[in-house]
Structure formats: C-alpha cells, structure tokens
C-alpha cells in the first residue's frame, strides 16, 4: 500500500505593518488588513509569539522622518522576552546620529534582519527611540519572520 | 515495494543585478551574466514573473551616489502588478531626504526585504526616483526573491 | 512495511556576531558565545566555510560610529574566496560618503542580504574600510547565512 499522503504543514510566517495608533513602546502592528501575513504565529500586544521552537529569520524596517531636523538620536531594536528570563534580549539594533542637515525636512530608514534560534513562548517586539518621528505606512514600516 | 524516489523540485529563486542601460522605470536587470540566479521564475521587461502561488521572501538594494550633493529626495520601491488589479501595489519602499552635505560627493544605499504571499502571474518591479543617481555595479544594486 | 523514518537533516545555518579583537581584514567574528548559531557550516579565521553546494541567503550588518565626524568613506563588503579562483568575488557591497555633520558624534549602519549559489569549500568573509569606526556589539554588527 502506498504511504499516507504527506500532511503539508502550514508555514510559520508573519509580516505585520505599521499602525499609527502606537502610543508607547513596544510598537503596535497592523495584523489584519492590507499586505499582512500571520500564520502559525500569534500576535499579542505588539509582539509576535512563537509557538514552535526552531530557526527563524526575523526582520524589521522602520521609516523615520521629520520636518525640521534636530538630529535626535534614533534607535530601532528587535528584542525578545520570555517569562523564563528576567531581562529582555536585544537581538538586533540599529542606531543613527548626525544623519541630516539642521532644520531640513528629512527621511531615513533602518533595516534589520537575521537568523535566530527561537523557543516556544518567546515574544518578539520592536522598539524605537522617537515614536513621534516614525511614519507608519505599510510599505515603509514593518516587522516579520518566517521559520526556516 | 518501496515508495518512488522523491522528485526534488527546483527551488524558485532569483537574484538579478544592476543593468546600466536602464533608461526609464521600472529598472531593468541583468538576468544572464555574473552572479545572477534565475530558476523557476521568469524575467520580463524589468519584472520578475511569479509562476507559482505561495510565500516568497523578496529583497532589493539600490546604491545611489552623486558628485555634488543637492539632496534630491530619493525613493526606492518594490511594487507588484497583476492584470487582475487596476493599480500597482507598493510592497516595500525606502525614502531618503537630507542625507548629505550640499556640494559634496556622496553615496548611500537603500535596502528592502520582506515576506509576501504572491500569486501566479504577479509581476514584481523596482522603481527609483532618480535614475541618474543609481550606480549599477552587480554587488551594489540588486533585486531578488526566493520561495519559502 | 512502512518506509524508514525520515532522517531530519540539520539545517545549515550561521549567525556570528561582532568580535572587538578584530585587528585586520577580514573581520573576525564571535562563533561561540551569546546569540551565535553555527550548524552545518564551519568558521575559520573570519570566514564561513561552505561544506555543501547549494543556494544560501547570506546577510551582514555593520554598525559604524565615531566621536567627531570627518566623513571618511565607509565600505562594507561580503566577499567569497575559493582556492579554484585566483581572485576574491565581491558578492554584496555598501558604500557611504558624506553621511554626517563635520565634527559631530555620529552613527550609521550598513545592511546587506541576498541569495547566492555557493559551492562546497567557498569561504565567505566581511571586509570594512575603516575598522576603527566599527562597533562590535552583538546586536549591531553580525554576519550570517542559511541554506534555502
């Protein structure tokens, strides 16, 4: 007899886009409308919750812009939280200082992406230093991952 | 009897590099020579044509440079076109303003990468705002994807 | 009789982080402690050594910063070396010029990532133009790959 048909497992993947009603850290994300993906991973209060241990490629882009450049330091972090550990773990980070000409309208992006070994119940978040300078267009600011 | 040997499916993947004879939008790409990859995906008039629905990681980098900075706004977009939809969909975008010191020689890159659910017959393209400021070296300006 | 249980092959993956005792090129990497991954790939004198031919997504981020900007040109390269070829092949490269205000404290990142067809015994390295301007925090400067 032929072997039973292979059960095609759903790919664990997420692509969340900017949500302009973020008021504090971590950033909140659009998880329903537009070019969003969420499969085999949960979204909870700004975080992607891993439900299967394994290797994941995690990425994020944040689009910063302003009208009168003051060169406030910008930071963009992807970090991990797990109830087993007392402290957040910064997985990836980008920083910018002295990036525009004083007083000018300016715009700049930060991109992060890398592979991590994640454990079931890990919560992943994105943090930025200057929330008021983030533009949340879905094509410009996003956060995602997929299981290798 | 043992099951038939598994037919290893060709990975759907593309990595195209800058082509300096691009004269208008969308950008055109080198699809034959150098460190180019094109397998299970077609290249047509600047676009990558999807022939199998599924999840894809899509990425692009563009290298902008100039002899005398005048801070023209720069944009770098990856967008999708499908005959079923009336309008292009911007999947990812990077913008830069006030990024160099007036009059100086300057150079800057924009990188984009994320996961999308693509449908057979989707065409993916890259657009930039200032074609004359793009350098097309194969290591500096590229466009690619792979099916997860 | 049922077919033998599938032998789950170990995923070929690496994520190496910045090592501040890099003294010359190529950059050296932390391959043991922290959020490091190294499986099915070898690390040797700054390089990731491929032991199985195939398609790989390769990425790197470098975090440059300085106390007093003088706009030294910055470059960040991922290149490949193989004893069969006389010359290094630059796979990906980022360059920056005129990126900060003279005399100011500054910080900037360069990110690279793309798919390549690599061959067993290929050695992959990262090179930067100004080693003294690199910050080696594990979340800020890294180098990795995974087999598709």
């Amino acid at each position: 007899p032929s072997p039973p048909p292979e059960k095609k497992e759903l790919r664990k993947v997420a692509h969340l886009t900017g949500k302009s009603n973020s008021r504090s850290m971590p950033l909140e994300w659009e998880d329903t409308y537009g070019i969003v993906l969420l499969s085999g991973v949960k979204y909870k209060k700004g975080g992607l919750v891993i439900n299967e241990t394994g290797l994941y490629f995690v990425y994020s882009k944040v689009y910063f812009r302003g009208q009168s450049c003051n060169n406030l330091p910008l930071s963009h972090k992807v970090y991990m939280r797990n109830s087993k550990y007392p402290q957040d773990l910064v997985m990836m980070e980008g920083k910018m200082m002295s990036y525009c000409t004083t007083g000018q309208m300016w715009a700049r992006s930060s991109y992060l992406g890398a592979v991590f070994n994640l454990t079931s119940a890990d919560h992943l978040y994105v943090n930025v230093s200057e929330l008021s300078l983030v533009n949340f267009e879905e094509s410009q600011t996003f956060f995602g991952l997929y299981k290798l | 009897p043992s099951p038939p040997p598994e037919k290893k499916e060709l990975r759907k993947v593309a990595h195209l590099t800058g082509k300096s004879n691009s004269r208008s939008m969308p950008l055109e790409w080198e699809d034959t020579y150098g460190i180019v990859l094109l397998s299970g995906v077609k290249y047509k008039k600047g676009g990558l044509v999807i022939n199998e629905t599924g999840l894809y990681f899509v990425y692009s980098k563009v290298y902008f440079r100039g002899q005398s900075c005048n801070n023209l706004p720069l944009s770098h977009k990856v967008y999708m076109r499908n005959s079923k939809y009336p309008q292009d969909l911007v999947m990812m975008e990077g913008k830069m303003m006030s990024y160099c010191t007036t009059g100086q020689m300057w150079a800057r890159s924009s990188y984009l990468g994320a996961v999308f659910n693509l449908t057979s017959a989707d065409h993916l393209y890259v657009n930039v705002s200032e074609l004359s400021l793009v350098n097309f070296e194969e290591s500096q300006t590229f466009f690619g994807l792979y099916k997860l | 009789p049922s077919p033998p249980p599938e032998k789950k092959e170990l995923r070929k993956v690496a994520h190496l982080t910045g090592k501040s005792n890099s003294r010359s090129m190529p950059l050296e990497w932390e391959d043991t402690y922290g959020i490091v991954l190294l499986s099915g790939v070898k690390y040797k004198k700054g390089g990731l050594v491929i032991n199985e031919t195939g398609l790989y997504f390769v990425y790197s981020k470098v975090y440059f910063r300085g106390q007093s900007c003088n706009n030294l040109p910055l470059s960040h390269k991922v290149y490949m070396r193989n004893s069969k070829y006389p010359q290094d092949l630059v796979m990906m490269e980022g360059k920056m010029m005129s990126y900060c205000t003279t005399g100011q404290m500054w910080a900037r990142s360069s990110y690279l990532g793309a798919v390549f067809n690599l061959t067993s015994a290929d050695h992959l390295y990262v090179n930067v133009s100004e080693l003294s301007l690199v910050n080696f925090e594990e979340s800020q400067t890294f180098f990795g790959l995974y087999k598709l």
Partner: antibody, heavy 119, light 111 residues
C-alpha cells in the same frame, strides 16, 4: 506651559554686534529646533536660520551668512542669535520660534526683541 | 528660494462676511502627499500666531471659522464669518525647503 522668553530691546551703532537670547521652558528643550525670524518696521517676516538644540549646529539663510551666529546652552535651555556688522536696515524685531520635528510649522514664538541700529 | 506672493495686499471686509486670502508659490511646495504651507495671523505688537498648517489643518485652539485649502502652488485661507478680533495681518509661509519664506502679508481691515 510652553514659553519662549527673549532678552530686552537693544540700541546699537552701525558696525557693532548684537546678541539676543531666547530662554525656553515648559517642554523638553532638546526635542525642538529653534528658528529665528525678523521683521523690519512695517514690513513682512524674514527667516534667518535654525539651530539644533540637540546637536548645536545651525543652518543659516544665505542672505545672513557670515554675519549671523546661532548658539545653544542646554544647561540653561537658552538659544542665542548674534548678528554682526550691523547696518541701519537690520533695525527690526527679532523673534525666536520652536519647531517640532514631527510637525509642519513653528508653533510657539517668543515675544520679540527690538534691535535698533542708529548712529 | 521659493518666492511666496500674497493677494490682495489689503482686503476690506465687513464683520460677519466671508474673507478669502490667496497665496501663490513660485514652485510646488508639495511632497509625498502633503502640502508644506502654513498660515499665520499677526496683530500689532504681537508675534505671529499659527492658524493653519500643512495647507488645511487647523491648529489646536483656533476657531473653526478659519480654513485652508489648496495644493502645489496655489493656496487659500478662508474666514467664513469675520469677527472683530480677526482684523489683522495674515502671512503664508512655506516649510518645504530652506530657506523658509513668507508672503509679504495681507492686511485684513474693517470695511
């Protein structure tokens, strides 16, 4: 509440310099650039330049290049605008105004400082 | 630099009536879906006061009788029903690029 308080009126001779101060309170000083705008008697508004309160460097209107210097003292949340080689046509009210980087316009202004240049 | 031209120089209107002030820019002040045009009101002996930002957005605390419109190079400030406290000088200003530039002003006076 947000306040920008400028120094008092000045009378200067042609060729001299004047230094006007603008002290900020009621908000996080280093989060906003400070712009300087002047207004000659019975005339319109003229933008002079802007200073980064965080970084301390400035961008100036080309018209005043070489004559205007803007500085910042973060310890006292004060910005200074110095104009040198004064001439009679520099007689004006000088205003400082803050500009939120995330917004579109100068939202709070100082009360103005009248500088009179006369021999 | 971008030159801003306001018209008319003086506008005489009766209280309760509608006032329409115009501002033209020598080049577009639009970028990325926004118009970088602001309107200020100035009364004698006082600093300018922000009324409208980004062409059509009412600054907090400004009465709803003030409205702005336009894009590209042509902009309008409208006061729907003039109150006695509205008689002042009005300036348009572009914040699209440095140097910021102002119009020469429109004086709104009681008819």
């Amino acid at each position: 509440q947000v306040q920008l308080v400028q120094s008092g009126a000045e009378v200067k001779k042609p060729g001299a310099s004047v230094k006007v101060s603008c002290k900020a309170s009621g908000y996080t000083f280093t989060d906003y650039t400070i712009h300087w705008v002047r207004q000659a008697p019975g005339q319109g508004l003229e933008w002079m330049g802007v200073i980064s309160t965080y970084q301390g460097d400035a961008s100036y209107n080309q018209k005043f290049k070489g004559r205007v210097t803007m500085t910042v003292d973060t310890s006292t949340s004060t910005v200074y605008m110095e104009l040198s080689s004064l001439r009679s046509e520099d007689t004006a009210v000088y205003y400082c105004a803050r500009f939120p980087d995330w917004d579109y316009a100068m939202d709070y202004w100082g009360q103005g400082t009248l500088v009179t240049v006369s021999s | 630099e971008i030159v801003m031209t306001q018209s008319p120089a003086t506008l005489s209107v009766s209280p309760g009536e509608r006032a329409t002030l115009s501002c033209k820019a020598s080049q577009s002040v639009d970028y990325d879906g926004d118009s970088y045009m602001n309107w200020y009101q100035q009364k004698p002996g006082q600093p300018p006061r922000l009324l409208i930002y980004a062409a059509s957005n009412l600054e907090s605390g400004i009465p709803a009788r003030f409205s702005g419109s336009g894009s590209g190079t042509e902009f309008t400030l409208t006061i729907s029903s003039l109150q006695s406290e509205d008689f002042a000088v009005y300036y348009c200003q572009q914040s699209r690029e440095l140097p910021y530039t102002f119009g020469q002003g429109t004086k709104l006076e009681i008819k």
